[in-house]
């Protein structure tokens, strides 16, 4: 006869490990007992369990409540046991010793490998600002056994660097993603991808990039100066900019206070029916936590009567 077992049994932390040991005997051979022990190098054998043909299952005190026989139906030549709720400390070498009649004793060894799936964590780097050089966007750390793989999935251009720390029964891997911040990266996803044999599928943690910036300010509304004449209604100036975080707007008049009746509505300055007193230099102040910008325009309100008089003069002069 001969013993059938596995060289390596792999199980995920917390799962039950089946330690196989099957005696393939000749006709008429009987198994008297199967003794299981842990036999790590450099340490004495530690008894695990005894499967006895007459007495049944005995579990040694150190493994009380954690070793069982596989559920029925059972073959009397099958000395396999279940190690419940595998923990990292269970990883190691195990031996089954089978006492048979009349063939004698047989033994076989297997290695139990306990996979510890990682629980990854993603830590954003310092605040990203346009104009910075190469900056840490995020770091991702995952610890497991064996060492997990940590990669990045993103459309953003950047560089990665990884380092690994070995512990007694596991390894921690940290990967950093560096980039040169630009406003085009704003809102883009940066995904840490962790792979490990103990995971059914890759674990993904996504971080949305936020890059602080403030665009140059400009004012719209004066494209056609002829529209800015006395009596015109609905005239307005709009301040144009964009930023992250979104900017706030403030309007002032350089050559005095804002005329009465002029309404400030965020980025928009609304005028009542125009009069000559609305002429002046207007300044739009745009600011966010990152920066501030100014843009100024000169409003010159035309008097249509003056204009028509001049035209008449011109005509008569001709």
């Amino acid at each position: 006869g001969e013993l059938e077992t596995s060289d390596v049994v792999t199980v995920v932390l917390g799962q039950d490990a089946k330690l196989p040991c099957f005696y393939r005997g000749d006709s008429g051979e009987q198994v008297g007992q199967v003794a299981w022990a842990r036999v790590d190098a450099g340490e004495g054998a530690q008894e695990l369990a005894l499967l006895h043909s007459k007495y049944g299952l005995h579990v040694s005190p150190a493994y009380e409540g954690r070793v069982e026989q596989p559920p029925p139906p059972r073959n009397p030549l099958d000395g396999s046991v279940l190690l419940r709720n595998a923990v990292q400390a269970d990883e190691g070498e195990y031996e089954c010793r089978v006492s048979t009649f009349p063939a004698g004793s047989f033994q076989a060894r297997l290695r139990l490998r306990v996979l510890v799936p990682p629980l990854p964590s993603l830590n954003p780097g310092p605040a990203l600002e346009e104009g910075q050089g190469l900056t840490l966007a995020a770091s991702c750390t995952a610890e497991g056994s064996p060492a997990p793989s940590v990669t990045w999935d993103t459309e953003v251009k950047g560089t990665t660097s990884s380092r690994s720390f070995k512990h007694s029964r596991s390894a921690a891997v940290t990967s950093e993603f560096h980039l040169v911040p630009s406003r085009s990266m704003n809102g883009q996803p940066l995904t840490c991808v962790v792979s490990h044999p103990g995971l059914l599928q890759d674990q993904r943690i996504t971080h949305i990039l936020h890059v602080s910036f403030l665009a140059e300010a400009s004012v719209r509304g004066l494209e056609d100066q002829n529209l800015w004449h006395i009596g015109r209604e609905g005239a307005m100036l709009k301040c144009l900019s964009e930023g992250q975080p979104p900017p706030s707007y403030n309007w002032t008049r350089l050559d005095g206070p804002l005329p009465s009746g002029v309404r400030v509505d965020g980025d928009t300055l609304g005028f009542p029916p125009l009069t000559t007193e609305h002429s002046g230099i207007y300044v739009c102040h745009v600011s966010n936590e990152f920066s501030s910008r100014d843009s100024q325009v000169t409003v010159d309100v035309l008097d249509p009567q003056e204009d028509s008089g001049k035209q008449v003069d011109l005509v008569s002069a001709s």
Epitope: A35, P61, R97
Partner: antibody, heavy 126, light 107 residues
């Protein structure tokens, strides 16, 4: 025929010592684990100590731990129990017994006691 | 330690009676249980091992059953030589422990 013969019992004062012997014959002594079991007058059976075949693994009941020592001399087919610091509650008939040999090389369990000696009486009294 | 509780502690029966003695372990012991018979002034004698296996030379009127925590010794037809004290013993853990005994007396 398997025979186990105990000797060494007797009257001893509290705090005293005795050494019990058990001579085995009629079987291969080296192949069997052995135990000592005692029975106080009018009481039940109490396992005292046991030793595996090679003599390397000795176990004791809590009530005698640190005071009694079990040993064996396989060349003389003899089992011993050295009893020190004896107390009145150690008064009993002490039996040596052979353990049934159907569990191989597994120290965590003992086996049934298939042969017993006739017993030797130990009396601890002042 | 595992506690072994026998019942009854004594019983009176007549020759030819069927006698049942029970033994309960304080925790599961698979079939690591033996039964012994002891007569006054004599050493105990192994009757049953592995809960139900009859020791060589023991009459077939003795039988054992059970596993886990509950066990039974049955004498199918009591004979005059069977009047004695009976002990159960677990050997699942060290120390092995005995029941307190059941004395079978003549009615």
């Amino acid at each position: 025929e398997v025979q186990l013969v105990e000797s060494g019992g007797g009257l001893v004062q509290p705090g005293g010592s005795l050494r019990l012997s058990c001579a085995a014959s009629g079987y291969n002594f080296t192949s069997y684990d052995m135990s000592w079991v005692r029975q106080a007058p009018g009481k039940g059976l109490e396992w005292v100590s046991g030793i595996k075949t090679g003599g390397g693994s000795a176990r004791y009941a809590d009530s005698v731990k640190g005071r009694f020592t079990i040993s064996r001399d396989n060349s003389k087919n003899t089992l011993y129990l050295q009893m020190n610091s004896l107390r009145a509650e150690d008064t009993a008939v002490y039996y040596c017994a052979r353990e049934y040999s159907d569990v191989v090389d597994y120290v965590s369990v003992r086996t049934p006691l298939d042969y017993w000696g006739q017993g030797t009486l130990v009396t601890v009294s002042s | 330690d595992i506690q072994m509780t026998q019942s009854p502690s004594s019983l009176s029966a007549s020759v030819g009676d069927r006698v049942t003695i029970t033994c309960r372990a304080s925790q599961g012991i698979s079939s690591y249980l033996a039964w012994y018979q002891q007569k006054p002034g004599k050493a105990p004698k192994l009757l049953i091992y592995a809960a139900s296996s009859l020791q060589s030379g023991v009459p077939s009127r003795f039988s054992g059953s059970g596993s886990g925590t509950d066990f039974t010794l049955t004498i199918s037809s009591l004979q005059p030589e069977d009047f004695a004290t009976y002990y159960c013993q677990q050997h699942y853990t060290t120390p092995p422990t005995f029941g307190q005994g059941t004395k079978v007396e003549i009615k």
